[in-house]
């Protein structure tokens, strides 16, 4: 037996992190996002659950809704009507999938100081929202959309086709929620509250994924979800718009699909209201390299929505799929005709373009070997966006302003020099016309949220600076974090290395690679985190490395699209390349290298362990994908095409984890999965296990009964991380 090696941080009054610290969330941080209700006013839920109103200009603040009112219905969330007369209170939150949940809603009348009693809302509701003006309510109940002109009025039923697991109105089905919309809703009010647009998803022909939910009963329940796997029948989508002023006179009007899209299988990807009678729809071919943006206008005379061909804008990728993870959405100018949009330039970097008439005549307004990430707000004279331009670090985010008024266009970085060491990764939240905005900095130092003047960019006040967290971390030995790049051939790979306290280059340390590596993801980010891997470095003396290989985002399409139609090849190759480079650095114990990942990361870690290189002693895969045929159509096909003989079946087959079962013989493999995973089905791990058994390869496994893709219930999470810690310490011969 090899002697166990115990890592002891040297004489220091500071203590190392413990696993308990991580599991208890002792070192979690806070952010502050104002809930804007006007150009200079916002709401915020206080620590003690009062809903507080703030006016930036008058410095006025008062409780608009007390915690006792919240508590009276066990409310955990709220929403103020635009006319400020009512608040909906949300309680009985019941999670469904990643974004979706059902809840009970109560309407509180702020004028009377009491709950609205007449025509109470049914329960549970799938989605509810106020109109942008006044206090109309739209909600989805049992897959149908209802409308209330006022909270106390009887509801008007807009759709009648809704049926569980068959037809969804105003809410997405599973695959659209997870892979296309990334929301729990599929309805959008026009800016003046006159029209309501919504999507109908017909899942009648979609195959069902069924799995057992064990619960506490004598018999398990079966969960059935229409879930199109790669190559399967997809949802049929239709978009409708209803006039909410006279919903009974004229029914919902269908918005036509562009001809070039309707000719084969297609997806709806997003809807953006441009003005009160103009709407912009985005569509995508099933083979996701062609996207069409269609601008439609209301024709009063026909009582219909018209989408002229000359208002169709095509975006096409010749090297991969359209867009990043999703196709970007347009940010329209005040003229309701021209818009700004992020898409790839001729060098393959995603940049902001200004489209006035045709995409061909688009004016590129950002350029360089970096990428524009998101357009936050377009006003009369400014455009605010985020990018990773500053100092050439792809894992940073700064906020920029481009002046677009009556002077030469100029670009200014709003955040680059604010708190340069502490803050290198920002997002922002703007008031309606950007008179004020909040900046939320996620690190690499302690997160901080600040309020700013939209004209001058001056900081007005600190909203949250995580003082308590700063104090509680004073006596903690945190590891050192480095973000650097390594070169191999013509490729550059950014990596983040987490080094144990008192790290000594002349010593040898075990190495754990944490990998995700999915297309258009990014792991090497300049953000603050105290999590499991922080603990492993701090307490157990393990060096942790995260590497962004080919297929990851924000470094141009050449790097991103390298994995197109061949998932599982370069992502793995690049992790292996990085490990070899880390060994060359001289402080890694070659005999003690491990890899772990979750979801796509579980797929990559499994393939890396089965690479036959002998680099890894052990590894963990949590909820891994094992074959792209088992995963959702929208995701798998975006990157892999179709699993058909005349398309890409061959690579679907040879990129499975099962195909490499034999290669697990010389590694210690821990396979973990939740049995109620609606996303990456337990089937994936069941098939890996079956292949390993068939190959007579020993491995370790753990399932989590009734846990989904996040394995997030308190007890399960504690068990999971404790179990993985034991496995790793055993692998690295670290004593308990």
């Amino acid at each position: 037996l090899r002697p166990s090696r115990v890592y002891k941080p040297e004489g220091n009054t500071k203590r190392a992190l413990t696993l308990k610290d991580i599991l208890n969330g002792t070192f979690s941080y806070k952010t502050y996002f104002p809930n804007w209700i006007s150009e200079q006013e916002y709401l915020h839920q206080s620590e003690d659950d009062n809903i507080v109103f703030y006016n930036i200009e008058t410095r006025e603040s008062y409780i608009i809704l007390s915690n006792s009112t919240m508590k009276s219905v066990n409310a955990t969330d709220y929403g103020l009507s635009p006319d400020r007369q009512f608040v909906y209170l949300e309680s009985d939150y019941s999670k469904l999938w990643r974004y979706s949940y059902t809840a009970t809603y109560y309407i509180y009348d702020l004028q009377n100081g009491e709950f609205v009693r007449g025509y109470e809302l049914p329960r549970p509701i799938q989605y509810l929202c106020w109109s942008p003006v006044g206090s109309k309510l739209a909600y989805v109940y049992q897959n149908n959309i209802y409308l209330k002109q006022r909270p106390g009025d009887p509801p008007f039923q807009i759709t009648y086709t809704g049926r569980e697991n068959r037809i969804f109105n105003g809410i997405p089905d599973w695959v659209y929620e997870e892979e296309m919309l990334a929301t729990k809703y599929a309805l959008w009010w026009s800016p003046d509250g006159k029209f309501l647009a919504y999507v109908e998803f017909n899942d009648s022909d979609i195959p069902i994924i069924a799995y057992s939910y064990y619960g506490d009963g004598q018999y398990p329940r079966t969960i059935n979800i229409p879930y199109p796997k790669a190559g399967a029948k997809n949802p049929v989508v239709r978009v409708f718009i209803v006039d909410t002023t006279y919903p009974h006179h004229v029914g919902p009007m269908e918005v036509p699909v562009p001809e070039m899209i309707a000719s084969s299988d297609y997806y709806f990807s997003w809807l953006t209201w441009v003005s009160s009678e103009r709407v912009c729809l985005q569509w995508l071919k099933r083979v996701q390299n062609v996207s069409v943006l269609s601008i439609c206008d209301f024709r009063e005379d026909w009582h219909a929505w018209e989408c002229p061909k000359n208002q169709e804008h095509v975006e096409e990728s010749r090297t991969g799929w359209a867009g990043g993870f999703f196709v970007s959405t347009p940010a329209f100018s005040q003229d309701a005709t021209s818009y700004y949009k992020i898409f790839s330039d001729k060098d393959g970097y995603k940049h902001i373009h200004y489209i006035k008439d045709t995409v061909e005549n688009a004016i590129q307004i950002t350029s360089g070997k970096w990428e524009a990430i998101y357009i936050f707000r377009v006003t009369q004279d400014s455009l605010f966006y985020s990018s990773n331009e500053f100092e050439g670090y792809p894992g940073r985010r700064n906020i920029y302003r481009i002046s677009i008024g009556n002077s030469p266009p100029s670009k200014k970085c709003v955040t680059c020099h604010l708190r340069k060491e502490r803050c290198q990764y920002y997002t922002a939240s703007f008031s309606y016309k950007a008179k004020y905005y909040a900046l939320v900095c996620y690190g690499p130092g302690l997160p901080i949220s600040t309020l700013h003047d939209g004209r001058t960019d001056q900081e007005i006040q600190v909203l949250e600076e995580n003082k308590e967290l700063e104090n509680s971390l004073r006596n903690i030995q945190l590891p050192k974090v480095e973000i650097k790049k390594l070169k191999d051939g013509g490729l550059t790979f950014w990596y983040k290395m987490i080094l144990p306290p008192q790290f000594d280059r002349s010593k040898k340390y075990p190495l754990l690679i944490q990998v995700y590596g999915g297309p258009c993801s990014q792991s090497v980010k300049s953000v603050f985190a105290v999590n499991w891997i922080t603990y492993l470095a701090s307490k157990e003396g393990i060096v942790i490395a995260l590497v962004d290989g080919r297929g990851t985002a924000f470094q141009g399409d050449k790097f991103l699209h390298a994995v197109y139609r061949k998932l599982g090849v370069y992502e793995v190759e690049d992790q292996l390349t990085a490990v070899r480079k880390f060994i060359e650095m001289g402080f890694i114990d070659e005999e003690r290298i491990a890899i772990w990942g979750w979801s796509y990361g579980g797929y990559v870690s499994s393939l890396a362990l089965a690479s036959g290189t002998g680099l890894f002693k052990c590894g963990i895969a949590v909820a891994p994908v094992s074959s792209w045929e088992y995963y959702a159509s929208i995701y798998s096909e975006r990157f892999m095409g179709l699993p058909t003989k005349d398309d890409n079946l061959e690579h679907y087959k040879n990129s499975t984890v099962m195909a490499r079962a034999e290669y697990f013989r010389n590694v210690d493999y821990l396979l973990i999965h939740g049995t109620a995973d609606d996303n990456v089905h337990f089937q994936n791990s069941a098939q890996i296990a079956k292949a390993l058994v068939n190959a007579q390869v020993d491995f370790q496994a753990m399932w989590y009964s009734d846990q989904n893709h996040g394995i997030s219930s308190g007890r399960s999470q504690n068990h999971l991380y404790t179990h993985m810690t034991h496995f790793l310490k055993q692998c690295f011969s670290l004593s308990d």
Epitope: S338, D345, Y354, K356, I363, Q364, I365, S367, I402, I404, N406, S407, P408, P409, S410, K411, K412
Partner: antibody, heavy 121, light 107 residues
Framework: QVQLQQPGAELVKPGASVKLSCKAS????????LHWVKQRPGQGLEWIGE????????NFSEKFEIKATLTVDSSSNTAFMQLSRLTSEDSAVYYC??????????????WGAGTTVTVSS | QIVLTQSPALMSASPGEKVTMTCTAS?????MYWYQQKPRSSPKPWIF???NLASGVPARFSGRGSGTSFSLTISSMEAEDAATYYC??????????FGSGTKLEIK
């Protein structure tokens, strides 16, 4: 089509003044700002200044603030630049050019053929 | 004021050759603009907002850069591309400044 017409040449004596014209055709002069650019023989381009024909507002390069005067006669759709106290250093080709300041353009889209000014006794 | 330095001052290229000329600003600018001028002719707008080709400019031309470093590239030199190219910026406006020019000749 849109054009800016400038006389071909002006011969002036040192110490004198010259008034260069720039006649716009194909568009209304008050719709766009007009800039003047100097180019000495075999040399690069040097910005002199600009005038907004709609309101007469102007900006100059510091170097030309005393040297140049910019005016517009909207009735004849013509812009003028007067150069005073001329020296041999002022011998150059002078271009008038229109600024396309539509959103995100901001470039000089139409140029006159240039007037060659020769300062010689 | 912002000074623009163009390099090289003079260069020659054979037909089909890739050509790159640079423009360096003395301090950071938001965007760069380029003009082409042929002998005895007025300048013509060539590239605006760093990377956009003006109307009628062949697709073999491209513009790149940010901060203080900008470039104009011709992917495959043609005889008609022989000219002097000037960069120009608005960031210190007023004044507007031009670079001293790069004269491109055909071999």
């Amino acid at each position: 089509q849109v054009q800016l017409q400038q006389p071909g040449a002006e011969l002036v004596k040192p110490g004198a003044s010259v008034k260069l014209s720039c006649k716009a055709s194909g568009y209304t002069i008050t719709s766009y700002s007009l800039h003047w650019v100097k180019q000495r023989p075999g040399q690069g381009l040097e910005w002199i200044g600009e005038i907004n024909p709609a309101n007469g507002d102007h900006n100059f390069s510091e170097k030309f603030e005393i040297k140049a005067t910019l005016t517009v006669d909207s009735s004849s759709n013509t812009a003028f630049m007067q150069l005073s106290r001329l020296t041999s250093e002022d011998s150059a080709v002078y271009y008038c050019t229109r600024l396309d300041d539509s959103r995100f353009h901001w470039y000089f889209d139409v140029w006159g053929a240039g007037t060659t000014v020769t300062v010689s006794s | 004021q912002i000074v623009l330095t163009q390099s090289p001052a003079l260069m020659s290229a054979s037909p089909g050759e890739k050509v790159t000329m640079t423009c360096t600003a003395s301090s950071s600018v938001s965007y760069m603009y380029w003009y082409q001028q042929k002998p005895r002719s007025s300048p013509k707008p060539w590239i605006f907002l760093t990377s956009n080709l003006a109307s009628g400019v062949p697709a073999r031309f491209s513009g790149r850069g940010s901060g203080t470093s900008f470039s104009l590239t011709i992917s495959s030199m043609e005889a008609e591309d022989a000219a002097t190219y000037y960069c120009q910026q608005w960031s210190g406006y007023p004044p507007i400044t031009f670079g001293s020019g790069t004269k491109l000749e055909i071999k």
